[in-house]
């Protein structure tokens, strides 16, 4: 599957929107930093099959969508930017769904990528628990925003690698 150029652009647009969403000075949030244990090995295109990496990225976008669709998230971020962010994520989900299906076939996807999808889900579970523990404070959201930006940046690099392999 050749991930379309539009998908990469969409990912870059999503990153720009995430960057614009910041509301408070991150300098005041240093003590709130946290190790969420980003499952980098899941996104390693060399070590794992391409379909596995793509479906893990699909899960990451789905979980990001879920995270930023909550009531607490709506209260934390600018509504207009959030809406634009949803649109980018939705578009990316569509692109990736087509890609994963083409790469493996629907019936094989669930079984084959169970471990990598589970790793991504656990990662987002840690993020959710962190936010809850911090009572969804502005700084906690800033830390999470920075973390999601890093995850997105990492997966953007993965996509470039996957396109080169094609």
């Amino acid at each position: 599957c050749d991930l379309p150029q539009t998908h990469s652009l969409g990912n870059r647009r999503a990153l720009i929107l995430l960057a614009q969403m910041g509301r408070i000075s991150h300098f005041s949030c240093l003590k709130d930093r946290y190790d969420f244990g980003f499952p980098q090995e899941v996104f390693d295109g060399n070590q794992f099959q391409k379909a596995q990496a793509i479906s893990a990225f699909h899960e990451m976008i789905q979980q990001t969508f879920n995270l930023f669709s909550t009531k607490d998230s709506s209260a934390a971020w600018d509504e207009t930017l959030l809406d634009k962010f949803y649109i980018e994520l939705f578009q990316q989900l569509n692109d990736l769904e087509a890609c994963v299906t083409q790469e493996v076939g629907v019936e094989e996807i669930a079984l084959m990528n169970e471990d990598s999808i589970l790793a991504v889900r656990k990662y987002f579970q840690r993020i959710t628990l962190y936010l809850m523990g911090k009572k969804y404070s502005p700084c906690a959201w800033e830390v999470v925003r920075a973390e999601i930006m890093r995850s997105f940046s990492f997966s953007t690099n993965l996509q470039k690698g996957l396109r080169r392999k094609d």
């Epitope: 991150h26 300098f27 240093l30 003590k31 709130d32 946290y34 190790d35 969420f36």
Partner: antibody, heavy 121, light 107 residues
Amino acid sequence: EVQLVQSGAEVKKPGESLKISCKGSGYSFTSYWIGWVRQMPGKGLEWMGIIDPSDSDTRYSPSFQGQVTISADKSISTAYLQWSSLKASDTAMYYCARHPGLNWAPDFDYWGQGTLVTVSS
Amino acid sequence: DIQMTQSPSSLSASVGDRVTITCRASQSISKFLNWYQQKPGKAPKLLIYFASSLQSGVPSRFSGSGSGTDFTLTISSLQPEDFATYYCQQSNTLPFTFGQGTKVEIK
């Protein structure tokens, strides 16, 4: 390969202005903050201030507030440290280093080679 | 500002010795403590971050421990290339601050 390359050594007279630079390469420049550290001859490290190149938000150590200005130009992946009026006591080695911001990653993992500033009449 | 106090300010040791340097913060900094090594004429080099995480490429003879206000850098078996000055630095809150340094010299 991640690199922070600083501008060359400077010899200045008291009262003169100066701007030294730190150019980042091999990584996303706006994803990391850039900090500046002073080391006077034979002395220890002193933290001066930090900038987030993505929005140029800057913070200074109280000791350096009003004495220096930290800035950045993200279009050319470069951070700057400047003085409007140098003093003999500004003679030191100045280092830049990158910081991962709010991400859980090593602090100040890459450093510039340093810029030696000598202020003498 | 958070004050960082290192001890000792200098020490003499032999190759193969176990060396311990301590760093105390004037208030709790959780685990946001870094250790750097600096050799004359060179930029500092990160050894340990978040109190106990070994930076990539740093030999395993270096280790860090502690949290809150008291921290330790240990070199399990001193090597000739380890003679240098070591600094602790807190990154819990701005302004970041360094300890005054510990110079490790050859006995």
